[in-house]
Interface confidence: low
């Protein structure tokens, strides 16, 4: 008789997960000139260590603390690109403009980049078949605390101009719930951050409107400047030649708004 | 176009100096890691230092650690490799080469350096 | 640090295909490079990450890496395709970088 398991909502933890965690960590460390003393093997057993035999809906921030010391890393503070909603033109730009980095150009943000994972209470096992989802099931999951844990130290390390690109075609660019809008915003250290550059980046060819007086932005706006931390927008009009034009910025078409 | 050229080869005599400059063009210097890379006659590749992007971290062969110091200049665009107490197995011709990722997509020409008395 | 161990020398008829092998401990785990070099001239990038091949170089390289071993292949060997042979990965607990020792490919 097969042993009665708890079924989630969500998707359950990725194939290979263990091995995918490990061989993203040793590219990672190959990479990174300055993560090249990491053990990998020591980061995928503190990163097991967080879930493994655990109640996957009563995880805690403090449950990733070994794995947050191995995975220390210093980005350059003053050129951290935050996102929300708009992760794979935040990535394209990073990998262009490679002096900026958002929280999936670091070790642990590469390391867990669109997986899922989840264990069981008591058991050393990994649950492939269903993992707790944010809404259905409960925001203290595995994955949820991970990423919470790790925006909020990316955040609180950001200084002088830290920018964020926002997607103006959803219908709330700015999401207090979303991760940015949740956690990264009031992590932000006003001692340390002079301001914050808000990038909308349009989705239509034709869409010529400012998005940055959208409701949202408003709101944004009025988070951010209570916080004591200055705020400015940009419309980014066209994305694809806001790329090609950070490849090649001596282009004479890249003088013009984009 | 994308260009390496190393200079500052010739001969020296054993613990003697010399200092090796690779000027880069045609792309933004300090956005990339760059390596100096030798090869003795008729011999295979040996990498001898690595220096960050920034400036800030800096690897080198056991066989030179302590003789050899890698450095830049962003605002020149240039690489250097500072040689001191040469021996006559440093005989090699020196290529400096850009890193992109973990491979080098861009190498100079090379420049001959000879020790001997 | 890994030692990459090449043959050094390989030879092919013109049209067939050759085949480089790069052997180390665990190298599947690492990511190799290969670097085609001829006489009196600096060494060109062939493949990187594994199998990855640089704009302008021919379809016919192609790369893998598996278990020990990671392999260059040239497909429909070319008179031209006459040059040294080098791996190249990374020992990321020193920091250094390690070439293998180089294979003299020889088109008959």
């Known amino acids: 008789v097969p042993r009665w398991r708890q079924q989630w909502s969500g998707p359950g933890t990725t194939k290979r997960f263990p091995e995918t965690v490990l061989a993203r960590c040793v590219k990672y460390t190959e990479i990174h000139p300055e993560m090249r003393h990491v053990d990998c093997q020591s980061v995928w057993d503190a990163f097991k260590g967080a879930f493994i035999s655990k109640h996957p809906c009563n995880i805690t921030e403090e449950d990733y603390q070994p794995l947050m010391k191995l995975g220390t890393q210093t980005v350059p503070c003053n050129k951290i690109l935050l996102w929300s909603r708009i992760k794979d033109l935040a990535h394209q730009f990073t990998q262009v403009q490679r002096d900026m980095f958002t929280l999936e150009d670091t070790l642990l943000g590469y390391l867990a980049d669109d997986l899922t994972w989840c264990g069981e209470f008591n058991t050393s096992k990994i649950n492939y078949q269903s993992c707790p989802d944010w809404r259905k099931d409960c925001s203290n999951n595995p994955v949820s605390v991970f990423w919470k844990t790790v925006s909020r130290r990316f955040a609180e390390a950001a200084c002088d101009v830290v920018h964020v690109m926002l997607n103006g075609s959803r219908s709330k660019i700015f999401d207090k719930n979303s991760t940015f809008g949740s956690v990264e915003v009031h992590n932000l250290q006003p001692e340390k951050v002079q301001t914050l550059e808000a990038w909308v980046i349009h989705g239509g060819r034709e869409d010529s409107r400012d998005l940055c007086q959208d409701p949202t932005i408003k709101e944004l706006e009025s988070i951010i400047s209570k916080r004591n931390i200055q705020f400015s927008c940009k419309n980014i009009y066209r994305p694809d030649k806001f790329l090609q034009c950070v490849k090649n910025p001596e282009d004479s078409s890249c003088t013009s708004e984009i | 176009q994308v260009q390496l050229v190393e200079s500052g080869g010739g001969l020296v005599q054993p613990g003697g100096s010399l200092r090796l400059s690779c000027a880069a063009s045609?792309?933004?210097?300090?956005?990339?890691?760059m390596n100096w890379v030798r090869q003795a006659p008729g011999k295979g590749l040996e990498w001898v230092s690595y220096i960050y992007g920034g400036g800030s971290y800096t690897y080198y062969a056991d066989s030179v650690k302590g003789r050899f110091t890698i450095s830049r200049d962003n605002s020149k665009n240039t690489l250097y490799l500072q040689m001191n107490s040469l021996r006559a197995e440093d005989t090699a011709v020196y290529y400096c080469?850009?890193?992109?990722?973990?491979?080098?997509?861009?190498w100079g020409q090379g420049t001959l350096v000879t020790v001997s008395s | 640090d890994i030692e990459l161990t090449q043959p050094p020398s390989v030879s092919v008829a013109p049209g067939q295909t050759a085949r480089i092998s790069c052997s180390g401990d665990n190298l599947g785990s690492k990511v190799v490079s290969w670097y085609q070099q001829k006489p009196g001239q600096a060494p060109v990038l062939v493949i990187y990450?594994?199998?990855k091949r640089p704009s302008g170089i021919p379809e016919r390289f192609s790369g893998s890496n598996s278990g020990n071993t990671a392999t260059l292949t040239i497909s429909g060997t070319q008179a031209e395709d006459e040059a040294d042979y080098y791996c190249q990965s990374y020992t990321f607990e020193s920091g250094s970088v390690v070439f293998g020792g180089g294979t003299k490919l020889t088109v008959l």
């Open positions: 045609g792309f933004t210097f300090s956005n990339y890691s």
């Open positions: 990450y594994d199998n």
């Open positions: 080469a850009r890193q992109a990722g973990m491979y080098f997509d861009v």
